[in-house]
Interface confidence: medium
């Protein structure tokens, strides 16, 4: 990887143990000001593999609310507006980082956690398994 | 919101200022052990709105590597394998949390940052703008 010289103005809270505990400022910097504010807000309805969004809430997690996509159909919507079962609606999943309160219920102590979330759905050609 | 009693065993590093600085253990707990490790690995090729994955690397960010999806086509792939421009391939975007080294190059001081990433693509019916 790239070696970057350490900034001499860093907080002096080095932990000899790795994996380490670090200081994190929860004042979120949002880099999304230059992106489309509408984003994919209506794609869930207009997609050929439409999905519903389900609220997943956990007060011990940061962010506490995550929206999970669930594909509405097994197949995909064709030009006539009908479900075509020769195609498959599948969830597009992504691993994201969240903060988990640890020990539980602590306001200022967290552990990084990786969770898998479904962001939306896409329409794919099914895998056909041929009998040997 | 739900009020949860504070755990008496929490680290005593309360900051009077909000937004606050918290302690985060970087020993990642992975909740994804029970999920399909392959996940959507081949959906990018089998989708009717296929995409390419581009590596975005930033040593000042954690995670330093993020993969960005770029839709391959303006339209969507039809049953004949041709691009149908009556439909539209669009990126499904998600806001994710990352840690940004702050001050820069510090190994143990971060700030939470929200970034928008394209996870994959879906096929949607285009918006038709009618002249009033």
């Amino acid at each position: 990887g790239i070696t970057i010289p350490r900034n001499p103005g860093c907080p002096n809270s080095e932990d000899k143990n790795f994996p380490r505990t670090v200081m994190v400022n929860l004042n979120i910097h949002n880099r999304n000001t230059n992106t489309n504010p509408k984003r994919s807000s209506d794609y869930y309805n207009r997609s050929t593999s439409p999905w519903n969004l389900h609220r997943n809430e956990d007060p011990e997690r940061y962010p506490s609310v995550i929206w999970e996509a669930k594909c509405r159909h097994l197949g995909c919507i064709n030009a006539d507006g009908n479900v075509d079962y020769h195609m498959n609606s599948v969830p597009i999943q992504q691993e994201i980082l969240v903060l988990r309160r640890e020990p539980p219920h602590c306001p200022n102590s967290f552990r990084l956690e990786k969770i898998l979330v479904s962001v939306g759905c896409t329409c794919v050609t099914p895998i056909v398994h041929h009998v040997a | 919101g739900i009020t949860i009693p504070r755990n008496p065993g929490c680290p005593n590093s309360e900051d009077k200022n909000f937004p606050r600085t918290v302690m985060v253990n970087l020993n990642i707990h992975n909740r994804n052990t029970n999920t399909n490790p392959k996940r959507s690995s081949d959906y990018y090729n089998r989708s009717t709105s296929p995409w390419n994955l581009h590596r975005n690397e930033d040593p000042e960010r954690y995670p330093s590597v993020i993969w960005e999806a770029k839709c391959r086509h303006l339209g969507c792939i039809n049953a004949d394998g041709n691009v149908d421009y009556h439909m539209n391939s669009v990126p499904i975007q998600q806001e994710i949390l990352v840690l940004r080294r702050e001050p820069p190059h510090c190994p143990n001081s971060f700030r939470l940052e929200k970034i928008l990433v394209s996870v994959g693509c879906t096929c949607v019916t285009p918006i038709v703008h009618h002249v009033a």
Epitope: T35 | S89, S118, P126, I127
Partner: antibody, heavy 124, light 107 residues
């Protein structure tokens, strides 16, 4: 109604720099790719550069390394920073936007909306 | 780069005439071919996109056809406001190229 208004053109010496701006209104600017197209006096149209909704940039070979296309979605503005200008860069520069039908971050777009153009003259 | 060659480079016609302009690509551009009209001192105006789709507000005397490498713009009955220069453009392969233009003049 979609409106594109260019500014920043003028007379500049060879090797000099100029920054063109395009103010966009009447559509959700951040959702769409944008481009610059130029037309030398008495000549045909020539695509210069495109920036897609994701911020990815594409250039014609003759301007690569000299021109930089950028956007500020908060200001609904498109820019073209032109450095190391040559006599052959003399042209009317048009800001162009795709149709509102296609929202993808892809660059294969034609141009449904054009600005009035701004003249760039490179001469000593 | 994909080269687009328009023919003729210029033509003289009368009001009411049927006019056809052709655009030939030196390799296939699939269906990513579009047509513009430009009047002196004005910005180009989109007429036809994706070979044969008329832009909103474009009179139906303008039509497009073709596929692959050979494309046509037809004006079924030339009107006084149609005297202008017409350009084809491909967006199949970067750099997106334009034809050299066809000037339609009054006979």
């Amino acid at each position: 109604e979609v409106q594109l208004v260019e500014s920043g053109g003028g007379l500049v010496q060879p090797g000099g720099s100029l920054r063109l701006s395009c103010a966009a209104s009447g559509f959700t600017f951040p959702s769409y790719g944008m481009a610059w197209v130029r037309q030398a006096p008495g000549k045909g149209l020539e695509w210069v550069a495109t920036i897609d909704a994701a911020g990815d940039t594409y250039y014609r070979d003759s301007v690569k390394g000299r021109f930089t296309i950028s956007r500020d979605n908060a200001k609904n503005s498109l820019y073209l920073q032109m450095n190391s200008l040559r006599a052959e860069d003399t042209a009317v520069y048009y800001c162009a936007a795709p149709p509102q039908t296609y929202e993808g971050s892809i660059y294969r777009l034609w141009f449904a909306h054009w600005g009035q153009g701004t003249l760039v003259t490179v001469s000593s | 780069d994909i080269q687009l060659t328009q023919s003729p480079s210029s033509l003289s016609a009368s009001v009411g005439d049927r006019v056809t302009i052709t655009c030939r690509a030196d390799e296939s551009v699939k269906t990513l071919m579009h047509w513009y009209q430009q009047k002196p001192g004005k910005a180009p105006k989109l007429l036809i996109y994706l070979v044969s789709n008329s832009e909103i507000g474009v009179p139906d005397r303008f039509s497009g056809s073709g596929s692959g490498t050979d494309f046509r713009l037809t004006i079924s009955s030339l009107q006084p406001e149609d005297f202008a220069t017409y350009y084809c453009q491909q967006t199949y392969s970067a750099p997106h190229t334009f034809g050299q233009g066809t000037k339609v003049e009054i006979k």
